[in-house]
């Protein structure tokens, strides 16, 4: 099943996707669409690139903020709403016969927590959530530590997220 990423309403969501251009600089078409990857292309395309640049965006909220020319085609959705929830497809159209790379990721948008932050949680976010967090500006902040989501409630998650001081924070759950 898809990897899940959680973002709060009004924040930026970051959905990672990348490939290694071979040779470097030899870019390939990529599409992002809402809905699982179909047999060709993307359904409900939100952003599309060609061999040179982004050439189609259905909204100004969709951005490739990574180093697109090095194959970082991670999608940033700015100012997310509940309607942005769902499965997204990143399709990398590697030239050749049935060479496409397809990546399905699930975005879960939740309402902001209306709770008092817990003052005791001052730990580093990546150690609190091994393999679970991505940030909109810095890409995946992952360790190789196996395991499931730590036994922490959403209030604590939001507290830790706020400590990032990064409006693009997206929490990833396996």
């Amino acid at each position: 099943s898809e990897v899940e990423y959680i973002a709060e309403v009004g924040q930026n969501a970051y959905l990672p996707c990348s490939y290694t251009p071979a040779p470097p600089g030899n870019l390939v078409p990529v599409c992002w669409g809402k809905g699982a990857c179909p047999v060709f292309d993307c359904s409900n395309v939100v952003l599309r690139t060609d061999n040179r640049d982004v050439n189609d965006r259905t909204s100004g909220r969709y951005w490739l903020k990574g180093d697109f020319h090095k194959g970082d085609v991670s999608l940033t959705i700015e100012n997310v709403t509940l309607a942005d929830s769902g499965v997204y497809c990143c399709r990398i159209q590697i030239p050749g016969i049935m060479n496409d790379e397809k990546h399905n990721v699930k975005l879960v948008v939740i309402k902001p927590a209306k709770v008092t932050p817990a003052p005791t949680l001052q730990r580093d976010l990546t150690s609190a959530f091994p393999r679970m967090l991505t940030t909109g500006e810095h890409g995946p902040a992952e360790t190789q530590t196996p395991g499931s989501l730590p036994d922490v409630n959403l209030t604590q998650i939001f507290t830790l997220t706020n400590e990032l001081r990064d409006s693009g924070a997206t929490i990833r759950t396996a």
Partner: antibody, heavy 117, light 107 residues
């Protein structure tokens, strides 16, 4: 109005070759994947091949892989299917279809390919 | 590859009656399921895509439903021009596959 017009069908001997063309109009051709689908006489539909809008990515059914080659010329708004090593079982009406992602939303009227000695 | 099984093979009905056609997939197709109508000597015509969305120009008497592996095409009240062969098609996984078709004939 979307229009797709196939041509190039005909009678060919087993082992022979044929090249089908599909002229497209009424939409931005280079923005869409295109497919070939065939239908043997009195039978159902069988997807044959597809190509991405840019032409870089291609897809084939196992039954034609290595024998058929799909291509496109976006400057001419034309889709092609080069068919080599034809067999009797390739006899069918061949349709080209616009394939935005999963459904085939517009079809041509088809061209008949008959493989017989 | 994903196998699509349509039932029944033939449906004998009168104009004005309701037609219910079934399509079952051997595994989930992520709701990328389409329905086509084909009349003798003509190309197939897209009726329904993504399981439940009517294609441009398709009358409201045609509706699609279902998800995952089980899908249904319903024609609420058959018109004389609706008697034809209907195919389902999945586009969730390569290769594209079609069902074997259901013929809706006049009773």
């Amino acid at each position: 109005e979307v229009q797709l017009l196939e041509s190039g069908g005909g009678l060919v001997q087993p082992g022979g070759s044929l090249r089908l063309s599909c002229a497209a109009s009424g939409f931005t051709f280079s923005s869409y994947a295109m497919s070939w689908v065939r239908q043997a006489p009195g039978k159902g539909l069988e997807w044959v091949s597809a190509i991405s809008g840019s032409g870089g990515s291609t897809y084939y059914a196992d039954s034609v892989k290595g024998r058929f080659t799909i291509s496109r010329d976006n400057s001419k708004n034309t889709l092609y299917l080069q068919m080599n090593s034809l067999r009797a079982e390739d006899t069918a009406v061949y349709y080209c279809a616009k394939s935005p992602y999963a459904p085939l939303d517009y079809w041509g009227q088809g061209t008949l390919v008959t493989v017989s000695s | 590859e994903i196998v699509l099984t349509q039932s029944p093979a033939t449906l004998s009905l009168s104009p004005g009656e309701r037609a219910t056609l079934s399509c079952r997939a051997s595994q989930s197709v992520n709701d990328y399921l389409a329905w086509y109508q084909q009349k003798p000597g003509q190309a197939p015509r897209l009726l329904i895509y993504d399981a439940s969305n009517r294609a441009t120009g398709i009358p409201a008497r045609f509706s699609g439903s279902g998800s995952g592996t089980d899908f249904t095409l319903t024609i609420s009240s058959l018109e004389p021009e609706d008697f034809a062969v209907y195919y389902c098609q999945q586009g969730g996984h390569a290769p594209i596959t079609f069902g074997q078709g259901t013929k809706v004939e006049i009773k």
